[in-house]
């Protein structure tokens, strides 16, 4: 603790100029004071001034008023500093002395004589209010006041609490009257060294080094650090914890960059056609009548369906078509004839049969010819009779289908199973695909036919097909293939368009 006992001398009266021994001072009592402050004693005794002592210069002669003086010699109030916990009780001895010698340092002069003394014993609390008193004896009167205050930076009832206001990284506070800390705005904690972060800043995921700040820890973002950061490269996905990549609906792959719902995201099919998804970035447009092209973007000619009969020529119009009929025919599609068999209307050896009592006719065409007047040569490939991508070829009166590998039959309708030969080694599962068989290998094997035994690095054997990227340590199978567009499967071995029930990983 640390404080100051202050004694303010106000007035001393010694009208007769007498000493304590009854003698008078010549020419007058040149008066100075000795003050002794010590611990409380019921009976004041001689001995050391345990709380301090102080002397004044000569303050006046006989009777005088003592003025306040803040510095230098003769300072008033008198200061008795202490550096212990103030006990709340004290004993004070004030002695008035006459000196024949030096005004400034009467203590050192020989022949000093006591004029009077007073003793005060009691309790005194620390505070700014002065306690005023007056003591009389037969010859003298002394008016004075006193108090105990704490030294700078000391606080509390006994001046025992040290507190120094500060505003640095070890504390941001001022001191209360009792010595407790009062944090500056924006700071908290026992020593006011903890900043109060931006309101709402996430307790675990954010922190601050100064008030109203919110700095995010790794993996978190946003004004309040309450939004996780998804895996770097995550395109169409979100996270609930940092570095996750949970795909949005319609997206797949490690980075949610494979479009499983191209139709919805891109609307590639035009002119009211129907879009069907078929794997990552795969889709098919089914055109409405009158449209063609990959995206049904091409409008068909209104004449494309050959609506004009009997050799009529078709002309496209804005929203329709018009048939120009040959001589002897009329009607919207030149379907009505003004000819009879007498006009020999049947071409290419067709035989004419009269109808409606000779007012019209019908032609019976020889093989390889067709049309109302047998005017058209039959193209047996127009009906697209070949399935599974087979090519149709006209061969005289008949046609043949040239099948793609893996298919057979008159119309290429029969599928040749590549799996019948059991091409997959080590218990691999075989799947018939358009381009041949594909094997799904058991754990520990890889290769197109499961012929490669995996040893240490699961990606070293190149288990991913079709240019896929291999990652290890991401799944129980030791590797994961990130498929390029157009392929799926645990090894990206399946082109888009597999049966939907087939399992795959991406």
């Amino acid at each position: 603790g640390s404080g100051i006992f202050q004694l303010r001398l106000q007035e001393f009266v010694n009208q007769r100029g007498m000493l304590a021994n009854g003698q008078s001072c010549e020419p007058g009592c040149r008066t100075f004071f000795r003050i002794c402050l010590k611990h409380f004693q019921a009976t004041f005794s001689e001995g050391p001034c345990t709380f301090g002592n102080v002397s004044t210069p000569v303050l006046g002669t006989n009777s005088f008023v003592v003025r306040d003086k803040n510095s230098g010699s003769g300072r008033n109030p008198l200061q008795l500093p202490f550096n212990f916990t103030w006990p709340g009780t004290f004993s004070l001895n004030i002695q008035a002395w006459h000196t024949p010698g030096d005004d400034l340092r009467p203590e050192t002069s020989p022949g000093n004589s006591l004029i009077s003394q007073i003793i005060i014993q009691g309790s005194l609390a620390v505070g700014k209010i002065w306690r005023t008193d007056e003591q009389n004896d037969t010859l003298t009167r002394l008016s004075y006041s006193y108090r105990v205050i704490c030294s700078d930076n000391y606080y509390g009832e006994s001046c025992s609490r040290l507190c120094k206001k500060r505003d640095d990284h070890f504390g941001h506070y001022e001191c209360q009257p009792d010595g407790s800390l009062s944090c500056l705005p924006g700071w908290t904690g026992k020593y006011c060294d903890q900043p109060i972060c931006l309101s709402g800043c996430h307790e675990q995921n954010g922190y601050c080094s100064k008030p109203d700040e919110c700095i995010c820890r790794p993996g978190w973002q946003g004004r309040l650090c309450n939004e996780c950061i998804p895996h770097n490269g995550c395109r169409h996905g979100t996270c609930s914890i940092p570095w996750q990549c949970a795909c949005d609906e319609g997206w797949g792959g490690l980075f949610c960059d494979q479009d499983l719902n191209y139709c919805t995201h891109h609307s590639p099919c035009k002119n009211g056609s129907t879009c069907s998804n078929s794997g990552p970035k795969g889709y098919t447009c089914t055109c409405l009548p009158g449209y063609t092209g990959e995206h049904c973007e091409l409008g068909l000619s209104k004449c494309a369906s050959n609506p004009c009969r009997n050799g009529g020529s078709c002309k496209d119009q804005e929203n329709s078509y018009h048939c120009l009929c040959p001589p002897g025919y009329y009607g919207q599609h030149c379907e009505h004839s003004t000819l009879t068999c007498a006009d020999s209307p049947c071409f290419n050896g067709g035989s004419c049969r009269e109808r409606n009592q000779g007012s019209s006719y019908a032609c019976e065409c020889p093989p390889n010819f067709t049309g109302s007047n047998c005017e058209k040569k039959v193209d047996r490939c127009t009906s697209n009779p070949c399935a599974n991508g087979g090519q149709c070829q006209n061969r005289g009166p008949s046609r043949t289908c040239r099948c793609r590998p893996g298919f057979t039959g008159t119309h290429c309708e029969l599928h040749i199973s590549d799996c019948a030969r059991s091409p997959c080694a080590h218990g691999g599962t075989c799947h018939d695909l358009e381009n041949g068989p594909v094997c799904t290998c058991p754990a520990g094997f890889s290769g197109r036919r499961c012929e490669v035994r995996i040893t240490h690095d699961a990606c070293a054997s190149g288990p991913c097909f079709n240019g896929a990227t291999c990652y290890t340590g991401l799944s129980p199978n030791n590797f994961v293939c990130n498929c390029p567009y157009g392929f799926v499967g645990s090894r990206c071995e399946f082109p888009v368009g597999l049966p939907p029930s087939f399992p795959w990983v991406a």
Partner: antibody, heavy 121, light 107 residues
């Protein structure tokens, strides 16, 4: 018992840089009660405070060295670091790391053994 | 910049009292710490918060701080107290050390 161990000292060319490490054991660098400081002492001279860091990464530097100094922390390694660039002969000193305690009003109660950095060609 | 001034050296006889001063503008309004450093060793904190001793520091070390001066007092000085002593305070966010005082125990 808390221990601080410096490493990374040695001979450095003038104009070069140094990176010193201070490994803390026996206590967590992430405690809210401490700052972690670097102090240096040139041969035969007094102590000079370089700067300090809190576990969150807040840093404070001696204004006279601020332009050349970076202090960083790695809580996962319970270590903090001093990077100093554009070194000159007068940077030759023993470099100490120390723990500054908020409760001790910034007094440094634990010090490392020091690592000597000599800047010379 | 803030400076702390110490006498370069203080000599004391064994068993006597050594007082080391540390002066700085309004130093009494800051908390002073004192460090002891023996040759070839790291500094050791002997006084913090003006007058408090860390555990393990002998009672003969005491400190005070008011006005512009902090004082480290070693009463009953022993030969083992011969060392360099540094005062330290914080000026805003910067640590400041005094220049150091070499205490020599005579005899």
């Amino acid at each position: 018992e808390v221990q601080l161990v410096e490493s990374g000292g040695g001979l450095v060319q003038p104009g070069g840089s140094l990176r010193l490490s201070c490994a803390v054991s026996g206590g967590s660098i992430s405690s809210s009660s401490y700052y972690w400081g670097w102090i240096r002492q040139a041969p035969g001279k007094g102590l000079e405070w370089i700067g300090d860091i809190y576990y969150t990464g807040s840093t404070y530097y001696n204004p006279s060295l601020k332009s050349r100094v970076t202090i960083s922390v790695d809580t996962s390694k319970n270590s903090f670091y001093l990077q100093m660039n554009s070194l000159r002969a007068e940077d030759t000193a023993v470099y100490y790391c120390a723990r500054e305690d908020v409760i001790l009003r910034g007094g440094s109660d634990y010090w490392g053994q020091g690592t000597l950095v000599t800047v010379s060609s | 910049s803030y400076e702390l001034t110490q006498p370069p050296s203080v000599s004391v006889s064994p068993g006597q009292t050594a007082s080391i001063t540390c002066s700085g503008q309004r130093l009494g309004d800051k908390y002073a710490s004192w460090y002891q450093q023996k040759p070839g060793q790291s500094p050791v904190l002997v006084i913090y918060e003006d007058s408090k001793r860390p555990s393990g520091i002998p009672e003969r070390f005491s400190g005070s701080n008011s006005g512009d001066t902090a004082t480290l007092t070693i009463s009953g000085t022993q030969p083992m107290d011969e060392a360099d002593y540094y005062c330290q305070a914080w000026d805003r966010d910067t640590g400041v050390f005094g220049y150091g005082t070499r205490v020599t125990v005579l005899g």
